[in-house]
Interface confidence: low
């Protein structure tokens, strides 16, 4: 039975040209995290594998940095980065947990963080 929950940074906004940290946290489970995938609408950004470490998609090597922790840092943001991002936690024995973050990249300096929320 999957008992865990994923807490994410929720709906967030950032300014064009800036950077943002995408962060998920898996709680309420003793399952072992074997791998975390970061994806944007089914496009793989990065993988953090318990055995192999970090792997950044070649297309994003210049703009994506691993961490902090199991999170992901997006740099040199453009308005095209606006959209949904997913953290996919592969765990044993529970299975797969998915968290969703919506990022809005703004042209002007009106960026502010949204409230944190939980995804069951």
């Amino acid at each position: 039975m999957m008992t865990g929950t994923i807490e994410t940074t929720g709906n967030i906004s950032a300014e064009k040209g800036g950077s943002i940290i995408l962060q998920c946290h898996l709680s309420s489970t003793t399952a072992q995290v074997t791998q975390v995938n970061w994806e944007q609408q089914d496009q793989l950004l990065a993988i953090c594998n318990a055995d192999l470490g970090w792997h950044i998609s070649p297309s994003f090597k210049d703009r994506v940095a691993p961490g902090p922790g199991l999170g992901l840092t997006l740099q040199s943001l453009t308005v095209n980065d606006t959209g949904e991002y997913f953290c996919i936690y592969h765990t044993y024995p529970d299975g797969t947990y998915t968290g969703r973050i919506f990022l809005e990249v703004l042209e002007s300096s009106v960026a502010e963080h949204g409230a944190r929320f939980q995804i069951p």
Epitope: Q35, N37, E39, Q41, D42, Q43, L44, I47, N49, L52, H55, S57, P58, S59, N80, E84, F86, I88, H90, T96, T98
Partner: antibody, heavy 118, light 114 residues
Framework: QVKLQESGPGLVKPSQTLSLTCTVT?????????WNWIRQPPGKGLEWIGY???????SYNPSLKSRVTISVDTSKNQFSLKLSSVTAADTAVYSC???????????WGQGTLVTVSA | DIQMTQSPSSLSASVGDRVTIPCKAS??????VAWYQQKPGKAPKLLIY???YRYTGVPSRFSGSGSGTDFTLTISSLQPEDFATYYC????????????????FGEGTKLEIK
């Protein structure tokens, strides 16, 4: 239980447009996931055609992009494929499938054979 | 496009055999590979995702391994119902407007009774 079922003409004339519909039961296609079309020519391997996401975003195989349109009818919980200017090379079993992010194509329809012939 | 090469295209084995089916990618995929089983006239079934994770309900005799460009599906003790065609698939990326790599499948390896 999630089920996908393809429907549409089994025979299409060359240069015409192939139109297929996938009816999904047991899950609302506007809730989550990417909803895909995949084809398999007789005796050959699988080719991904494209998808439409639960939020309406589309993505197509570049080799087919100029001829493909995938759309959704939320009221009927269906998504559709249109492939224009077909030739005999488009003869294949066409299947719809649901992809779960981070996993793969987890649910498939049984597929429907479309033959392109005069 | 990322090419997925499956060789051999067919393989003969007996019930109880240990079988390995290789798949080679044309570029580094990390662990973003899935494996499917397809029987004649039926839809493919997902067996393995992220190179080595068994999908729900898949028997433990099926296992996947590999990272980078070389991947393997292993059936530890072949059962009569395992004779089918097996496809590897890269799930590394999808074609967005600025990123034009489609999901691609290998040509398949048909597992036949010896």
């Amino acid at each position: 239980q999630v089920k996908l079922q393809e429907s549409g003409p089994g025979l299409v004339k060359p240069s015409q447009t192939l139109s297929l519909t996938c009816t999904v039961t047991g899950y609302s296609i506007t809730s989550d996931y990417a909803w895909n079309w995949i084809r398999q020519p007789p005796g050959k391997g699988l080719e991904w055609i494209g998808y439409i996401t639960y939020s309406g975003g589309t993505s197509y195989n570049p080799s087919l992009k100029s001829r493909v349109t995938i759309s959704v009818d939320t009221s009927k919980n269906q998504f559709s494929l249109k492939l224009s200017s077909v030739t005999a090379a488009d003869t294949a079993v066409y299947s719809c499938a649901r992809r779960q992010i981070g996993l793969g194509f987890t649910y498939w329809g049984q597929g429907t054979l479309v033959t392109v012939s005069a | 496009d990322i090419q997925m090469t499956q060789s051999p295209s067919s393989l003969s084995a007996s019930v109880g055999d240990r079988v390995t089916i290789p798949c080679k990618a044309s570029q580094d995929l990390s662990t973003a590979v899935a494996w499917y089983q397809q029987k004649p006239g039926k839809a493919p079934k997902l067996l393995i995702y992220s190179s080595s994770y068994r999908y729900t309900g898949v028997p433990s005799r099926f296992s996947g391994s590999g990272s980078g460009t070389d991947f393997t599906l292993t059936i530890s003790s072949l059962q009569p119902e395992d004779f089918a065609t097996y496809y590897c698939q890269q799930s590394y990326s999808t074609p967005q407007q600025h990123y034009s790599t489609p999901w691609t499948f290998g040509e398949g390896t048909k597992l036949e009774i010896k």
